[in-house]
Amino acid sequence: CDLPQTHSLGNRRALILLAQMGRISPFSCLKDRHDFGLPQEEFDGNQFQKTQAISVLHEMIQQTFNLFSTEDSSAAWEQSLLEKFSTELYQQLNNLEACVIQEVGMEETPLMNEDSILAVRKYFQRITLYLTEKKYSPCAWEVVRAEIMRSLSFSTNLQKILRRKD
């Protein structure tokens, strides 16, 4: 499974698109900054076996895809960039699904560490709650865009684990 290579490229493309999606200066939104409690320890791949790393990566990307597929998101971003970004995420999800199938000898490995998956889900729940409380304002979306860039950057740590354990 050549996930590490394809996923790194896809992740880089997603980050570039997310950067291009910025519509307002982050400096004008400093008052809206928020600590979402990114579960950084969940991206320390040393605690994971390969399938579990794949599973956490998928969770991160699926939740990001969910977030950017809402009607509120459609209203907030430039459509062609949003579509390209979403397509990139979808492609990564497909790659990760295929990887589970292609990996030999992973059958007895648990697919997940439930605590890690729940930590990622709660993180995205906090993001969704923040957007709701801020009534999906342009600054709120800008803060979230910056946060997702940060979380996608962190997910590269998990990709390194996959590369190391190939």
Partner: antibody, heavy 126, light 110 residues
Framework: EVQLLESGAEVKRPGSSVRVSCRAS????????ISWVRQAPGQGLEWMGR????????NYAQNFRGRITITADKSPLTAYLELSSLRFEDTAVYYC???????????????????WGQGSLVTVSS | EIVLTQSPGTLSLSPGEGATLSCRAS???????LTWYQQKPGQSPRLLIY???SRATGVPDRFSGGGSGTDFTLTISRLEPEDFAVFYC???????????FGQGTKVEIK
């Protein structure tokens, strides 16, 4: 919880087309695929294809390519199945089905059907 | 293309007995992507087991799934009257996404 509501029963002539709709309500996400699965009388289940409403991306089973079109609206979240060049053997109950966003981990979510419509009977008869 | 073959076609048992249903794949299937459904007459299928062995919400613990590679089983430890139905196994393969169902096993009252 997701509810899937399909359109009513149809009677069609051989060679014609049918369009079945499936409206989703509840905790829906356009970022999860909606599939169509059919069941001929007294027979098993057969996956026909799926659509990802968020992007309009479709995947079709080999058996139906060239005859099947799946489309979707994002608001309200609705999927449509169109099957053309109908034959007698297309007489079946057509189900729409979707994964669950609650399945942990999400990587299993799209590999299964957690929610099913009530089914729409399509009868092909001359 | 993967073919799933379920056996037996029909299983005649009494309430209280145990049942073992088999699902055999024509090639290796990830157990993580193996799912079981129950369908009663006139009803839509219901998700029972996913990921090979995880029970769906509300499914009693008398249902269990197991197996790997090409051989998978659904076990019902003690049949209750409401368990009699047709059971289907289903696998997922990607890319491109393909969902395959077995032909079903009918568990009927003896």
């Amino acid at each position: 919880e997701v509810q899937l509501l399909e359109s009513g029963a149809e009677v069609k002539r051989p060679g014609s087309s049918v369009r079945v709709s499936c409206r989703a309500s509840g905790d829906t996400f356009s970022s999860y695929p909606i599939s169509w699965v059919r069941q001929a009388p007294g027979q098993g289940l057969e996956w026909m294809g799926r659509i990802l409403p968020a992007l309009g991306v479709t995947n079709y089973a080999q058996n139906f390519r060239g005859r099947i079109t799946i489309t979707a609206d994002k608001s309200p979240l609705t999927a449509y199945l169109e099957l053309s060049s109908l034959r007698f053997e297309d007489t079946a109950v057509y189900y729409c089905a979707s994964p669950s966003a609650d399945i942990i981990p999400s990587i299993l979510g799209t590999t299964l059907f957690a929610f099913w419509g009530q089914g729409s009977l399509v009868t092909v008869s001359s | 293309e993967i073919v799933l073959t379920q056996s037996p076609g029909t299983l005649s048992l009494s309430p209280g007995e145990g049942a073992t249903l088999s699902c055999r794949a024509s090639q290796n299937v990830s157990r993580h992507y193996l799912t079981w459904y129950q369908q009663k007459p006139g009803q839509s299928p219901r998700l029972l087991i996913y990921g090979g062995s995880s029970r769906a919400t509300g499914v009693p613990d008398r249902f269990s799934g197991g197996g790997s590679g090409t051989d998978f089983t659904l076990t019902i430890s003690r049949l209750e009257p409401e368990d009699f139905a047709v059971f289907y196994c289903q696998s997922y393969h990607s890319p491109p996404p393909v969902y395959t169902f077995g032909q079903g096993t009918k568990v009927e009252i003896k």
